[in-house]
């Protein structure tokens, strides 16, 4: 019929599977007078024929690997053979069938890997080729490890990137490979076409011998360095070594100290650059990093620990210029007067900070010397010989020597003799009545003033009054502050009042002295007072159990996964309904009843982590009060972003004609998380057909160099496809295009005649 298999002469494209014997015509072209015949030219390969009436057919099976596209031309001729229409392009695209098996470039590969190498970092590539079309499954290769010998505890130490053939260590391999235990391994690798997905795929195998070499990039033992060293600095304290020469070493101070007293040289020797002071800092943790010539880390950093050893370089210090204690007139022998606590900045629980106390002088020596003693190690002062009389000597001064093993310090103690504490505090009221407060009364509010008096010597520990709530406030919602001049007590709210748990509280106060009462005198009912606190209800909003709820999930969790939950309670006991606010990305939903939070869409760490939303708890019924808390969802990275170019590379050019092969450098990036080391991309040309003209070589984990292989380029734009693999788990690959223009140059810039100014390349190579 007209249309599908016949029609006028016009440009057309036909797709035909290779390897099939001809079964039907390709097309019947119709002639318009004066055309009477048709002529076929181009890449016919004696396979394609056109009959004089315009019947286009092929006479034997095609082979895509010989020619993937036949570019033909058909012209309509008049009776004299003169072209009257056309010629028009007729394109025959030969569709691939899987008629070629993949073949490894080598039957045996050899490589070496260091123990503790980073998992996933390729150390060897196997490479197979398949003549079939790489854009179809027929030419898509899938690499697999068939067997690892030896296999210890059924654990694979090696892995292969199914697409690129890059062999690397697994996490277990990184941790367990040890050349002392097993210096060599053999892998049998298979490659299948059809992406490995079909039972009809072809395959090939190769053998890989791997030598495990020792990794000397190891953290040294912790170093001990004596403080205040007088030796000439810098002093070598330890060393690190990269596995190969030429590494550039540096130290990283994670603590960001104002003074970082360490350095490293290019041999990897680590030095302390100045004397250390343990009392300033007793330990240092920092990192040694080895980088390549481009400044990219070669491996993980090593943790260096330096402990600063103490010397006795600090004398004891007194707690204050004069320490004041009080003693009652009638106190008995052996009673504790108080404890002198001196300090020493040297290391605790060592001889350098172990202190001795000794009384070296007492003034006045009335009625005799030696009235006091001090416990040698505890510093506690006691009455040694007799009770004291205030009217004889109201005050004593002691000089106490405090010493460590090298230093002595004198401290001064003043002991005031005070009247005996034979009077108890007496409340002016025994019952302060009822006090009604709303439960939302502010914290810090003074709600009651209480007063007791004591007839003992004013402004001494015998007459000073301390108020305690001894009953009715087990939650500690109230407190009492005392005015030292008037002994007035101010009852204040320390914690929120709560109608729901304590509507009525019967509070009991006790008034007592800091000095003990004399023998035979006891506190009685006069030293106690009460009052009743009535708390009235205020309808309160629900209360979350936390201000911020936090959860952590992998960014690739399935939709519907529970990612966290929140809890709130209503003080009045009402039911609570939960909702979300600020879920701008529409990732989450919350169960209104339970507070469980679920994912409802794919999560993406690269869009932002943590993802912060607000959770709202609302009373069901009542006055529908609500409160808000934060929910922070920390998204853990998975390798879900293929590499891409780090910036726009339009405008790259070479001046035409090339006088010598040239090169340019480009940078790749991806949006996944890269910890200390940064990304480690591998680069290759995007298609085999580019290999005659171009070459790509890796510079470091993020940069590569694209070089021309010759100088015979046309004056036009070339689009170079580059394959970038991130070596992640799973490995992802991006194919990027670098447009490179070869153009005539004027003063090193691309020359474009007037009127051709769009898209002028701006970067010359």
């Amino acid at each position: 019929q007209e249309g599908k298999f016949s029609g006028p002469l016009k440009p057309m494209t036909f797709s035909i599977y290779e390897g099939q014997e001809p079964s039907q015509i390709i097309f019947q072209f119709k002639a318009n007078p004066p055309a009477v015949t048709f002529e076929l030219t181009g890449e016919t390969d004696n396979i394609f024929v056109i009959e004089r009436e315009g019947l286009l057919y092929y006479n034997r099976a095609l082979d895509r690997e010989t020619r993937s596209t036949h570019n033909l031309q058909v012209a309509a001729l008049d009776a004299n053979g003169i072209i009257v229409e056309g010629p028009v392009p007729i394109t025959i695209k030969v569709k691939d069938i899987n008629d070629n098996r993949p073949t490894f470039l080598q039957s045996k590969y050899e490589g070496s890997v260091r123990q503790n190498s980073r998992p996933g970092k390729p150390f060897l590539y196997v490479n197979a080729t398949d003549l079939d079309d790489p854009a179809t499954p027929n030419g898509q290769l899938y690499y697999q490890i068939v067997i690892q010998l030896p296999m210890i505890n059924n654990v694979m130490y090696f892995q292969i990137n199914n697409k690129t053939g890059a062999i690397s260590l697994t996490r277990e391999g990184s941790q367990e490979l040890n050349p002392a235990k097993n210096p060599s391994y053999n892998l049998v690798i298979s490659v299948k076409d059809m992406g490995g997905q079909s039972e009809n795929s072809f395959s090939d195998t190769t053998s890989v011998d791997i030598i495990v070499t020792e990794n000397i990039w190891k953290a040294p033992k912790p170093v001990e360095m004596v403080e205040n060293s007088t030796d000439p600095h810098p002093i070598k304290i330890t060393q690190v070594r990269w596995n190969d020469p030429g590494a550039q070493y540096s130290l990283v101070d994670k603590e960001k100290l104002p003074r970082f007293p360490f350095s490293i040289d290019q041999e990897g020797d680590i030095y302390v650059t100045q004397p250390l002071d343990r009392e300033e800092k007793d330990a240092y943790v920092f990192y040694a990093v080895a980088k390549d010539e481009y400044g990219k880390p070669l491996s993980y950093p090593l943790e260096i620990h330096v402990k600063v050893k103490d010397i006795n370089d600090n004398p004891p210090t007194c707690p204050s210029p004069v320490t004041v204690f009080e003693v009652q007139e009638n106190e008995r022998l052996g009673n504790s007067i108080g404890t002198l606590t001196a300090h020493d900045r040297d290391e605790e629980n060592t001889a350098n900070s172990f202190l001795n106390y000794r009384i070296v002088e007492q003034t006045p020596k009335l009625p005799m010397d030696g009235l006091f003693l001090i416990q040698t190690y505890a510093g506690m002062l006691q009455l040694a010989k007799q009770s004291l009389k205030k009217q004889d000597t109201p005050q004593y001064n002691l000089t106490i020597e405090v010493s460590d093993k090298d230093f002595k310090t004198l401290c001064f103690v003043q002991i005031n003799v005070i009247d005996i504490n034979d009077q108890i505090p007496i409340f002016e009221k025994s019952d302060y009545g009822n006090l009604t407060l709303a439960e939302d009364t502010n914290i810090g509010s003074t709600i009651l003033t209480i007063q007791a008096t004591d007839a003992d010597e004013p402004f001494t520990g015998s007459s000073k009054i301390l108020y305690h709530i001894i009953k009715g406030d087990s939650e500690g919602r109230l407190g009492v502050d005392t005015d030292p001049h008037t002994n007035t007590g101010y009852v204040i709210i320390k914690k929120p009042l709560d109608f729901e748990t304590a509507a009525v509280s019967n509070i009991v106060f006790k008034a007592e002295n800091p000095e003990p009462l004399v023998f035979g005198v006891k506190y009685n009912a006069s030293s106690f007072a009460k009052f009743t606190l009535i708390v009235t209800d205020v309808n309160e909003a629900p209360q979350f159990s936390q201000h911020v709820f936090q959860a952590k999930v992998s960014e690739d969790v399935a939709i519907g996964t529970k990612v966290g939950n929140v809890t709130a309670k209503d003080p009045e006991g009402l039911d609570i309904s939960y909702s979300l606010r600020g879920d701008t990305r529409g990732w989450l939903k919350i169960d209104h009843v339970t507070g469980e939070i679920f994912s409802v869409a794919p999560l993406d760490r690269e869009a932002g982590s943590p993802y912060r939303v607000q959770v709202v708890a609302t009373e069901v019924g009542g006055s529908s009060l609500s409160s808000v808390s934060e929910f922070h969802l920390i998204l853990m990275d998975v390798n879900d972003n293929p590499p891409r170019l780090a910036k726009d590379y339009t405008g790259l050019f070479f001046c035409h004609p090339l006088s010598a092969p040239g090169s340019l450098i480009f940078e790749a990036t991806d949006d996944d998380q890269h910890l200390f080391r940064g990304p480690h991309f591998t680069f290759s040309l995007g298609s085999g057909s580019l290999q005659n003209d171009w070459e790509v070589s890796k510079i470091n984990g993020t940069h590569a160099r694209l070089s021309t292989r010759h100088t015979e380029f046309e004056e036009r734009e070339y689009v170079v496809l580059i394959r970038i693999n991130d070596g992640g788990r799973p490995p992802l690959e991006g194919i990027v295009s670098l447009p490179v223009t070869f153009c005539s140059c004027v003063e090193g810039s691309c020359f474009r005649p007037a009127g051709h100014q769009t898209g002028i390349p701006t970067v010359g190579m």
Partner: antibody, heavy 123, light 113 residues
Framework: QVQLVQSGAEVKKPGSSVKVSCKVS????????IHWMKQRPGQGLEWIGY????????QYNEKFKGKVTLTADKSTSTAYMELSSLRSEDTAVYLC????????????????WGQGTTVTVSS | DIVMSQSPSSLAVSVGEKVTMSCKSS????????????LAWYQQKPGQSPKVLIY???TRESGVPDRFTGSGSGTDFTLTITSVKSEDLAVYYC?????????FGGGTRLEIK
């Protein structure tokens, strides 16, 4: 062998018509186009047009349209050129020639010619 | 119509001499699709019908002596006879078959001294 034999000389009065024949032999008549040329004494050649006997396709030089009619008789393998409304400037030798091209060949030239027919127009 | 101009209109040479004659077209005869020049050269001896010498501007017809050579492209063409013989006495025509109407040059008459 291929031959093109034209009819004999003609003397005609102005205003009359003449039909010159070109009988071919030695090949399949319908495979090739037959062309006609005019050559006046001491002058160059002028292309009049052609006929393709297979499909009876004709093409004329615009200059000779209305003056010349080309026909062919497949049964006798003969091509004809008729000149009408003769005038003195039609006096010339008229040549038929076979164009060498046919489907599958690459002979882009006149490979065989008739001996020529002289037409004289005179009162 | 494409106008074909031949020069010289006549020339006389001695046997053994080299002859070149020119043919110019008013537009290019080079076809872009096959890069061929649609031009032929014919020889017409006195009292005879024309006979082809050259087609596609430079392809010699079989049986034509190799002293006849066609050259040129586009609009300028040349027929060269390297060593003239007495039987080469004739009128030489160029003809274009690039577009209808096909046209001939006015001819170059070759005389033998």
């Amino acid at each position: 062998q291929v031959q093109l034999v034209q009819s004999g000389a003609e003397v005609k009065k102005p205003g009359s018509s003449v039909k010159v024949s070109c009988k071919v032999s030695g090949y399949t008549f319908t495979d090739h186009t037959i062309h006609w040329m005019k050559q006046r004494p001491g002058q160059g050649l002028e292309w009049i047009g052609y006929i393709y006997p297979r499909d009876v396709i004709t093409q004329y030089n615009e200059k000779f349209k209305g003056k010349v009619t080309l026909t062919a008789d497949k049964s006798t393998s003969t091509a004809y050129m008729e000149l009408s409304s003769l005038r003195s400037e039609d006096t010339a030798v008229y040549l038929c020639a076979r164009w060498g091209y046919f489907y599958g060949s690459r002979s882009y030239y006149f490979d065989y010619w008739g001996q020529g027919t002289t037409v004289t127009v005179s009162s | 119509d494409i106008v074909m101009s031949q020069s010289p209109s006549s020339l006389a040479v001695s046997v053994g001499e080299k002859v070149t004659m020119s043919c110019k077209s008013s537009q290019s005869l080079l076809h872009s699709s096959n890069q061929k020049n649609y031009l032929a050269w014919y020889q017409q001896k006195p009292g005879q019908s024309p006979k082809v010498l050259i087609y596609w501007a430079s392809t010699r017809e079989s049986g034509v002596p190799d002293r006849f050579t066609g050259s040129g492209s586009g609009t300028d063409f040349t027929l060269t006879i390297t060593s003239v013989k007495s039987e080469d006495l004739a009128v030489y025509y160029c003809q274009q078959y690039y577009s209808y109407p096909w046209t001939f040059g006015g001819g170059t008459r070759l005389e033998i001294k």
